[in-house]
Interface confidence: medium
């Protein structure tokens, strides 16, 4: 019996087609992805093949103005039209709190939404009961397939699930649910979830009875053969894990942003053993036409976005200096504003010993592309922020050793004075440079804001200590020459859309007046 699994993950609000790098589509003939194109491909596969499942491994939420405006209603609407068979909860599905998940998505989705390792308690338990499930048994042709969900247990550090959801260890939570499916005589079981490729592989290895793992969170691109676009494969598709009980378990992921549609064919024998698996992600490029009716629907929904981008989010009573003459040479107040917004967006009081889990931000000055003038009645709009942060990136959470941070700050000024983009703006950090010293030895003082303290204060950076830092995904991926961050980071979790982080902060503060306050000094 053959099953075709179509899968997406980490779509992050890319409802419209995008450019090849998943930013705003400029040249339509070279654009990719989007729900209208996805619909065309899914429908053509459904027409050709008998047993097809369309699955999503989480993080539909967060990433473009679509989510900022529609807050998840757009996800439910278009996923319903696409006819998804199941979705796993990702960490970003909790970005607007549990209410922001329940109302727009859980109550509106016509497909099961899954996670076996999220347990509700207190007053939430009855409110959310039945709105998401640990597993679902789906009829496919003449057979049944069990889908069991999972979500990163780091979600409380990455999003806003509140205090009434407990995120358990994935493997511990999955095993009893898989065992239950086995007692129900379900002998074909897919683990669908959002914990990253390393955990996907562990689930394949450790959870008895799981036949296939469809994952997300790490934006992993797998491909067999010559890849069709810029993404470099992390391994073959499917990636085969030998389980502890000797079975071969295919693990798949489909990069991110709706650029690819994962396509996996699984052959089961009569006992439900997987005897073969093969496939590849399908690049959703312009050779696949956008479905005209879905495209028309998208255009109808778009109108509200265009109106939103000119509305006032808040006011500034000071000039927001985002000029390259400032932000690439010294502390600039636009850099301070953005870093403060980044930290504010990551306030998660998860432990009594810590006032917060993260206190530090770094931001490449070259990523700040425009100032905002306060003399326009102080008005700040989404449009203004899109000029400051035009690249459609995310502000991510990483864990780094102090020694790596020191290297990053040395890199920040290794060729100071040439107006290069690597000069770092900061939050929760005090740095002093001595430019008379040779490159690689210019950081003379580096103090960081404590987290394990009731009164935050600045302490000298410790080389062997592990620190959490918020930074643009561009830096986490080694951009602007920050290869040491990419090579030495100990953990990397993708965060929220950059503009959304700053716009939310401005809306919350209502009036802003960021200053240059001595975060970066030269001796």
């Amino acid at each position: 019996w053959e099953l075709t699994i179509l899968h997406t993950n980490d779509v992050h609000s890319r409802l419209e087609q995008t450019s090849e790098d998943s930013s705003k589509c400029v040249n339509a003939s070279r654009c990719m992805g989007g729900v209208a194109r996805l619909f065309t491909k899914v429908q053509s596969i459904r027409a050709e093949e008998p047993n097809v499942l369309l699955l999503d491994a989480g993080d539909q939420y967060q990433g473009t103005i679509w989510f900022t405006v529609y807050k998840g209603a757009e996800v439910a609407h278009f996923m319903n039209i696409l006819g998804y068979d199941a979705m796993a909860l990702g960490n970003h599905e909790f970005d607007n709190g549990v209410e922001g998940l329940i109302e727009p998505l859980l109550k509106e989705a016509k497909f099961p939404i899954l996670s076996a390792n999220i347990k509700a308690k207190g007053p939430l338990a009855s409110q959310i009961s039945g709105l998401y499930l640990p597993y679902k048994v789906l009829p496919v042709g003449d057979e049944v397939v069990g889908i069991v969900g999972y979500t990163s247990k780091e979600t409380p550090f990455l999003s806003n699930p509140g205090t009434n959801l407990v995120f358990e260890d994935e493997i511990t939570a999955l095993q009893p649910e898989v065992d239950k499916l086995k007692t129900l005589n379900v002998n074909k079981i897919i683990a669908l979830g959002h914990s990253g490729f390393e955990m996907d592989k562990l689930i394949a290895q450790k959870v008895r009875g799981v036949d296939v793992v469809v994952g997300g969170h790490s934006n992993t691109f797998l491909y067999t053969g010559n890849p069709p676009s810029k993404e470099v494969p992390a391994g073959k598709y499917p990636f085969i894990v030998t389980s502890d009980d000797g079975r071969k378990v295919p693990v798949v992921q489909a990069y991110a942003f709706g650029k690819y549609l994962g396509y996996l064919k699984i052959e089961f024998d009569e006992r439900g053993n997987v005897i073969s698996s093969h496939g590849n992600p399908i690049l959703l490029n312009s050779s696949i036409p956008e479905d005209p009716s879905i495209k028309a629907d998208i255009n109808k929904w778009r109108i509200k976005l265009d109106n939103y981008s000119t509305q006032e989010l808040g006011k500034t009573i000071v000039y927001l200096d985002g000029s390259s003459q400032s932000c690439r040479f010294r502390e600039c107040n636009m850099g301070n504003l953005i870093c403060d917004a980044m930290i504010n967006n990551n306030l998660r009081h998860t432990d009594e010993m810590f006032w917060n889990h993260v206190s530090m931000c770094i931001l490449n000055g070259g990523g700040i592309r425009s100032p905002i003038d306060e003399r326009n009645n102080g008005t700040i709009t989404w449009e203004n922020l899109a000029a400051v942060l035009p690249f459609g990136g995310t502000f991510d959470l990483v864990q780094l050793k102090g020694s790596t941070l020191k290297k990053a700050f040395e890199h920040s000024v290794h060729r100071y004075g040439q107006s290069t983009g690597e000069f770092l703006q900061v939050g929760g950090i005090h740095v002093v440079y001595d430019l008379s010293r040779k490159p690689g030895d210019r950081v003379v003082k580096l103090d960081v804001l404590c987290t394990k303290c009731r009164v935050p204060s600045y302490d000298p950076l410790k080389m062997d200590e592990v620190y959490k830092v918020i930074l643009p995904n561009f830096l986490a991926n080694g951009g602007d020459g920050f290869q040491m961050i990419k090579d030495e980071l100990l953990r990397h979790d993708s965060g929220d859309q950059d503009i959304n982080v700053v716009s939310t902060y401005i809306s919350k503060m209502k009036v802003i007046y960021p200053a240059v306050e001595g975060r970066i000094k030269f001796s």
């Epitope: 053969g225 085969i240 064919k265 997987v274 005897i275 073969s276 698996s277 093969h278």
Partner: antibody, heavy 120, light 106 residues
């Protein structure tokens, strides 16, 4: 329906070489290894090796390394086995075989066999 | 390489008999064992894989069992069309066949 159609019988002289073909149909050719098996008259089966049509990668039983060379032509969905420096020991029926699935070498699909006779 | 040794080499049977063939591996092969049937002038046919799983369409009078080094193949009630040579095969490490057991009519 999966089918493997092999080329006809061969009578060859010692020292010569021969190329046996196996035309596959009814499945995604590139997704499954093609195996070759030797059966000498009245004897057991000997696995020769396999080729992965996707990338042309191959694996051989050490006994047949240097004796057999496996190739594929993806465009015609045909696998080939070339046998060189033939001796009477190489006289046998040669089968191409595809696994049930692509994980394990359980040969659910076999060609009809090609008889190779080496004789002066 | 792993050697698969079948017992017996020949078996004289009558219709209706219960027949058992064993195959011993020279080292553990987990349950990575298959059994094949070959009739004269035909290609082999897959009967059992994973030591005990019957292949699609194989009658339930054919069963297999075993794990590690000792494997058993049984025909519960022999029928005339079952007269053939039966081979065991392992693919735990590389791939080897046993020498075969020939079922003949008494």
């Amino acid at each position: 329906e999966v089918q493997l159609q092999q080329s006809g019988p061969e009578l060859v002289k010692p020292g010569a070489s021969v190329k046996v073909s196996c035309k596959a149909s009814g499945y995604a050719f590139a997704s499954y290894n093609m195996n070759w098996v030797k059966q000498s008259h009245g004897k057991s089966l000997d696995w020769i090796g396999y080729i992965d049509p996707y990338n042309g990668g191959s694996s051989y039983n050490l006994t047949f390394k240097g004796k057999a060379t496996l190739t594929v032509d993806k465009s015609s969905t045909t696998a080939y086995m070339h046998l060189n420096s033939l001796t009477s020991e190489d006289s046998a029926v040669y089968y191409c075989a595809r696994g049930y699935g692509n994980y394990k070498a359980w040969f659910a699909y076999w060609g009809q066999g090609t008889l190779v006779t080496v004789s002066a | 390489s792993i050697v698969m040794t079948p017992t017996p080499k020949f078996l004289l049977v009558s219709a209706g008999d219960r027949v058992t063939i064993t195959c011993k591996a020279s080292q553990s092969v987990s349950n990575d064992v298959a059994w094949y049937q070959q009739k004269p002038g035909q290609s082999p046919k897959l009967l059992i894989y994973y030591a005990s799983t019957r292949y699609t369409g194989v009658p339930d009078r054919f069963t297999g069992s075993g794990y590690g080094t000792d494997f058993t193949f049984t025909i519960s009630t022999v029928q005339a069309e079952d007269l053939a040579v039966y081979f065991c095969q392992q693919d735990y490490s590389s791939l080897t066949f046993g020498a075969g057991t020939k079922l003949e009519l008494k």
